[in-house]
Amino acid sequence: GCLTQLYENAFFRGGDVASMYTPNAQYCQMRCTFHPRCLLFSFLPASSINDMEKRFGCFLKDSVTGTLPKVHRTGAVSGHSLKQCGHQISACHRDIYKGVDMRGVNFNVSKVSSVEECQKRCTSNIRCQFFSYATQTFHKAEYRNNCLLKYSPGGTPTAIKVLSNVESGFSLKPCALSEIGCHMNIFQHLAFSDVDVARVLTPDAFVCRTICTYHPNCLFFTFYTNVWKIESQRNVCLLKTSESGTPSSSTPQENTISGYSLLTCKRTLPEPCHSKIYPGVDFGGEELNVTFVKGVNVCQETCTKMIRCQFFTYSLLPEDCKEEKCKCFLRLSMDGSPTRIAYGTQGSSGYSLRLCNTGDNSVCTTKTSTRIVGGTNSSWGEWPWQVSLQVKLTAQRHLCGGSLIGHQWVLTAAHCFDGLPLQDVWRIYSGILNLSDITKDTPFSQIKEIIIHQNYKVSEGNHDIALIKLQAPLNYTEFQKPICLPSKGDTSTIYTNCWVTGWGFSKEKGEIQNILQKVNIPLVTNEECQKRYQDYKITQRMVCAGYKEGGKDACKGDSGGPLVCKHNGMWRLVGITSWGEGCARREQPGVYTKVAEYMDWILEKTQSSDGKAQMQSPA
């Protein structure tokens, strides 16, 4: 299953399959997740080692047993690949690293006014993989405000150096934020020229295109079909690049198919997995296991659950079957693609779904009336769990926020439904940033069921929590995916990086905002909070957040929305915006429903009809 815990001061011994430089453990983990054979990783921050060559070292590891011996190493961080972790799988990495220079091939230099502008330039340049920006205080005046766009053979820095007044980061193309746009068309009987960066075997052009999209240096591809004249080249997928970023020439060629990487698509990227099953096709590779199962879909599920399995063949040969079960061959290779593809067989083949974003779990958990005042604009995909709860009576208006916690579940505040308990009047918008983008054609979710906490009473602050079951499940994308829930009764974790988001009022007597706002707010102890609200009872099922001096807070229209905190690189839903005395007043923190205290209730209510809790447990 999915394992998300990180091991501090620990290093996995042996099992190395690749190594590279990454700026932090989270990026190292992402590279492990997307590497076909990596199950475990170890990362050496700059502070953990004197050897300059090994600083920022990211070591990707494999193990037949799924684990490796851990040795103590001060400062080292180790962990697991996020294969099988559903919506947590993403190649998008937004962080900016201060005081760090990520080295690579510098192919473009320009003057910009901010690191964000530099990142935007990288994202909008077809060849840029990462960048470095020299701030206004950089020691050499002539380099100040320089934005260096970079690439490297592996897509990661060739070296990382600690350097004052330099900030570095990665292209946001994997976040589907590129302004370049993409070519969706694929061209039959056409072969592209230029430099081959990799060669893999694929069953069709679609798989070839997805592999190209997630390969760090592939910009376009040519696929040779299974009826290509040269037998040894059949099903070959050639991943290609060029200096210009586009093919310099193309040749009409029967039984070839060419196309482009979809990494520059805006708003939608293909999933990093291949879910189609190919009847009459055998995939060859290294044998991992053979098991008897009933049906090709069960064979695919078996492969997906066995984390090292990359692809499979389900044989329908009479000698491979007994009763209703047939042999399911679980296989792997060095590059994650079959080493041989045979047609006209009595098998059906396909790939593991371990990198698919869409698990079938309805709630994500982890083991281990009020807008934002004093906030700033959010950007696309920054808070992909945030939803807008809108009511359509004569006109339509935003009333509350909410958090997507599963394909079919939204968590919000009970008081949002005071006086509006009818599910038909509600429309739930997900995957949006600007309320003004909502038109009559914008898709929305309707409510199947509103589940208000049984102990909630109107005009009381207690148990201000409600679940919404959507009529139809939502697909996950970079802009629409769930927030993980804390573990039950989570009291030991000290959260230092917490944010509240919403479209609510920007001042007490204000109006709903167009762009989703965000504000970084520190948590306040319940004792401190109780002192500020002497007329109310602050229970252990509430959590407070705010600045002593005020100025930043949630406000009307943010109710039901998330208070999220980042811990060990992972966001968790700590609170639900509930109530407060005015907005952003001095010494009047916002009060939030403490989600950890309601985990039993959430899990009980989100249980599937067959009585099984459909929840994802990354640890």
């Epitope: 694929i186 039959q188 069709d204 099953i277 009459g280 329908l316 006209g344 098998g347």
Partner: antibody
Framework: EVQLLESGGGLVQPGGSLRLSCAAS????????MYWVRQAPGKGLEWVSG????????MYADSVKGRFTISRDNSKNTLYLQMNSLRAEDTAMYYC????????????WGQGTLVTVSS | DIQMTQSPSSLSASVGDRVTITCRAS??????LNWYQQKPGKAPKLLIY???SLQSGVPSRFSGSGSGTDFTLTISSLQPEDFATYYC?????????FGQGTKVEIK
């Protein structure tokens, strides 16, 4: 030039049998997956059956499973559909089609042969 | 089986009109979506494959878009020869399934 030519259709009583043929030319027949698709009068298209390049893998729509058998003779460049226990609802124009490798689309179609099941 | 739902089932339009036909799959089919045109008494003809790629010989006024579950066929400026029935088809899983068709008639 790719050509597909169906034959064998006609009028048959319920419970009866027919064998459709599809003669292929203009391409290397033995390397392509082939399909039968039908269209009832005034209705939409319905996939009936498919067969792998060597004939080892066969697939059927639930509505014809157990009654129809798809086969091919690569030496004769011919695709067949043996239809037994015919019903009135099997009345349709039957098309043979060739899948285009790598893109999973039915790129070439025959002109169709009409099967009428009636007493 | 994956259900393919086309809308509208029929439409009346004039020469020069922009026509849009939508197709929705009951589950995600990635880009494994094809569009066919069929004229009375004729076999279907492939127009668009892989959701958005124009088949060779098909006029550029035809275009396709979409991925996942929602797809669109657009005829930018309807011509007399375009009056026909249009079908979408998913090739993602067996059995491949077709939409019920959209008949484009002369207004």
């Amino acid at each position: 030039e790719v050509q597909l030519l169906e034959s064998g259709g006609g009028l048959v009583q319920p419970g009866g049998s027919l064998r459709l043929s599809c003669a292929a030319s203009g391409f290397t027949f033995s390397t392509y997956e082939m399909y039968w698709v039908r269209q009832a009068p005034g209705k939409g298209l319905e996939w009936v059956s498919g067969i792998g390049s060597s004939g080892g893998m066969t697939m059927y729509a639930d509505s014809v499973k157990g009654r129809f058998t798809i086969s091919r003779d690569n030496s004769k460049n011919t695709l067949y559909l043996q239809m037994n226990s015919l019903r009135a609802e099997d009345t349709a124009m039957y098309y043979c089609a060739r899948e285009q490798p790598g893109i999973a689309a039915l790129q070439f179609w025959g002109q169709g042969t009409l099967v009428t099941v009636s007493s | 089986d994956i259900q393919m739902t086309q809308s509208p089932s029929s439409l009346s339009a004039s020469v020069g009109d922009r026509v849009t036909i939508t197709c929705r799959a009951s589950q995600s089919i990635s880009s494994y979506l094809n569009w066919y045109q069929q004229k009375p008494g004729k076999a279907p003809k492939l127009l668009i494959y892989a959701a958005s790629s124009l088949q060779s010989g098909v006029p550029s006024r035809f275009s396709g878009s979409g991925s996942g579950t929602d797809f669109t066929l657009t005829i930018s400026s309807l011509q007399p020869e375009d009056f026909a029935t249009y079908y979408c088809q998913q090739s993602y899983s067996t059995p491949p399934t077709f939409g019920q068709g959209t008949k484009v008639e002369i207004k």
